[in-house]
Amino acid sequence: APSCPQNVNISGGTFTLSHGWAPGSLLTYSCPQGLYPSPASRLCKSSGQWQTPGATRSLSKAVCKPVRCPAPVSFENGIYTPRLGSYPVGGNVSFECEDGFILRGSPVRQCRPNGMWDGETAVCDNGAGHCPNPGISLGAVRTGFRFGHGDKVRYRCSSNLVLTGSSERECQGNGVWSGTEPICRQPYSYDFPEDVAPALGTSFSHMLGATNPTQKTKESLGRKIQIQRSGHLNLYLLLDCSQSVSENDFLIFKESASLMVDRIFSFEINVSVAIITFASEPKVLMSVLNDNSRDMTEVISSLENANYKDHENGTGTNTYAALNSVYLMMNNQMRLLGMETMAWQEIRHAIILLTDGKSNMGGSPKTAVDHIREILNINQKRNDYLDIYAIGVGKLDVDWRELNELGSKKDGERHAFILQDTKALHQVFEHMLDVSKLTDTICGVGNMSANASDQERTPWHVTIKPKSQETCRGALISDQWVLTAAHCFRDGNDHSLWRVNVGDPKSQWGKEFLIEKAVISPGFDVFAKKNQGILEFYGDDIALLKLAQKVKMSTHARPICLPCTMEANLALRRPQGSTCRDHENELLNKQSVPAHFVALNGSKLNINLKMGVEWTSCAEVVSQEKTMFPNLTDVREVVTDQFLCSGTQEDESPCKGESGGAVFLERRFRFFQVGLVSWGLYNPCLGSADKNSRKRAPRSKVPPPRDFHINLFRMQPWLRQHLGDVLNFLPL
């Protein structure tokens, strides 16, 4: 077969080929940020000629053109400056209102390198309508100027701009406009991952936390966010495998979907996942009717088995057939469960479509969506039961209109996105399901995204200050209790001057809380074994602090999961009859268990907890410590089975001021506290300049570093005695 000519360079940009120079290969241009390629792509035809999708005239030279943002077409009850036909990247537009009108949204907006304006639509409103003035986004024209209950407004975009969002909105009884805000965008514009992740995440969190059907609440503005622990979610992942998707891109589709599956199973909800790949025909790799669809490992393994070559005989993009296979799956499930049953009616459905282009065969995908909406009986009351996310990847031939038509439209949410490439998609899926935004006291959730602050990564972490200086660390285990070390409290019982500093999204310095009461283990006495030549003994080194007020849950403040509780059981996704022993077997399940603690500067440091035989050799080193234990005969007199041991090889050692902080593990994207920092043989911070300086112990140090942490599995009776009405403990 003839190959296509190689004279396809783009001045100022680069290109990639999906299948070399052979027929069927898609050539994709890219330009530096702030520029866009024209044309975006070319397809090598069987004749050996390049064809530009959608082009009417003959092949023109590819060039990188400057990105521009659309200008306002009209701005009501105010003025904007400067008045240009379109705006360059970095250019600003400012808005001011006439007297009697208040500006809502952004007074100044800047054109971003992806051709999208930053900020929010500026609206001059006098608050006269039943619904607020819905505004006119930049580049749009609105018809309809009445904002009473039942009134409708319609939008269209000027010139060659593409509308995403709702072209028609209705003022509802609750004072909220139906649908989602329309945005007019350049056909070549795309979304930045950092904008998509929170938008997608907010919507997804809404869906995951949709109001519990058994709880009758009056209709609130927007959707109530609340983890619904009893609900069921069907998640349908549709992966485009058509010819224009390169094998490498398909791998990233799969990886992104795996990330999604991993995250979704970390929520405390029942979930079934369907996996469908499609090109000319769909292929169902996992159906929600299969029991394995509820098992994360099974779902991920079916994803891993998805093969790019499965679709090599039919390489078109039949989005209709893919969505129709979802419809058929729903239909079968409805017949199985019974149309009128709660079991069927209470299932929430989320479809995520990952595609790189427009459907080019099989009819309009919108028809399949209409069938799906019909079978699920989606109306204003049941709007929460279906979410369709349409994600286009690789600005090339993605059809904004089609994606927008397929994506759900819900107030304050977005469901249709176009990303620049599969790398951006991966980033989005990594960051989108950020449960840490939830206001509920769900435990053990840390923000794992690359741009999260230290406190967002470990939001349970608190600092304890006796007076002005920080002295110890601790962990929130509920919204009012902190777990820490007893040895931090050596000044008798006057805790009136003590403060606990808790993370706060509004302040980088956190928020200080007074202590209502301190419960220090009565068994703790550092001098208990002085007569035996043990100058310091840290048995029972555990304390609980009750804060004077409840902590408001946020991205920066949230409890860690304590093993042996129902809360941790949910997070571990263990069956209901699980015991404390089961948790210990699951969490401390190896000779060397990777764990973490938080450093003085807030960063997360790594250790390995030694178990079984390795615990014995880890603890043995204490016999070399002659200052603290001058005539020690039995190491177990000092290192009782209350302690976990770390500090071998490459482990970091905690500093004195890190005492009381959580020793924790990560499982299924959730964090579990198994110990608390108590004492050690080496202090890496001693005499350092500041919190960021730690010194590694020299290899020749005698004794070598060792660190001992109170093992929470060994403190169960005490924890249950004091927290029995705060946490729900499992049987031992």
């Epitope: 000044d491 200052t627 603290m628 001021g657 001693l686 005499g687």
Partner: nanobody, 122 residues
């Protein structure tokens, strides 16, 4: 906050000995880790030795290990530094410090004495 006053510095020959004292006012002395730092002319302040609030554990800088001994007497609210086999490079102003956590981070320490000068010279 603990108030600290050092004493015992002076001129001593190489190989000689000196005992520094640090008197602390405030009933909370017994609950603080205590330490000695020193600062030679034109140099940064450096850690010398520390002792835990219990008196049970001590730490030394490598440069003084085996020559200096830190101790405390909680009944007298006093910290000591016994310095033997002194060398010219031990010449510095010696400061006493109190730290509740025991890390003695220079950026965080708020209880320092005014210092006592030790000169080792023949």
């Amino acid at each position: 906050q603990v108030q600290l006053v050092e004493s015992g510095g002076g001129l001593v020959q190489p190989g000689g000995s000196l005992r520094l004292s640090c008197a602390a006012s405030g009933h909370t002395f017994r609950s603080y880790y205590m330490g000695w730092f020193r600062q030679a002319p034109g140099k940064e302040r450096e850690f010398v030795a520390s002792i835990s609030w219990t008196g049970g554990s001590t730490e030394y800088a490598d440069s003084v290990k085996g020559r200096f001994t830190i101790s405390r007497d909680n009944s007298k609210n006093t910290l000591y530094l016994q310095m033997n086999s002194l060398r010219a490079e031990d010449t510095a102003v010696y400061y006493c410090a109190a730290d509740y956590s025991g890390d003695f981070l220079l950026s965080d320490l708020d209880s320092w004495g005014q210092g006592t000068l030790v000169t080792v010279s023949s």
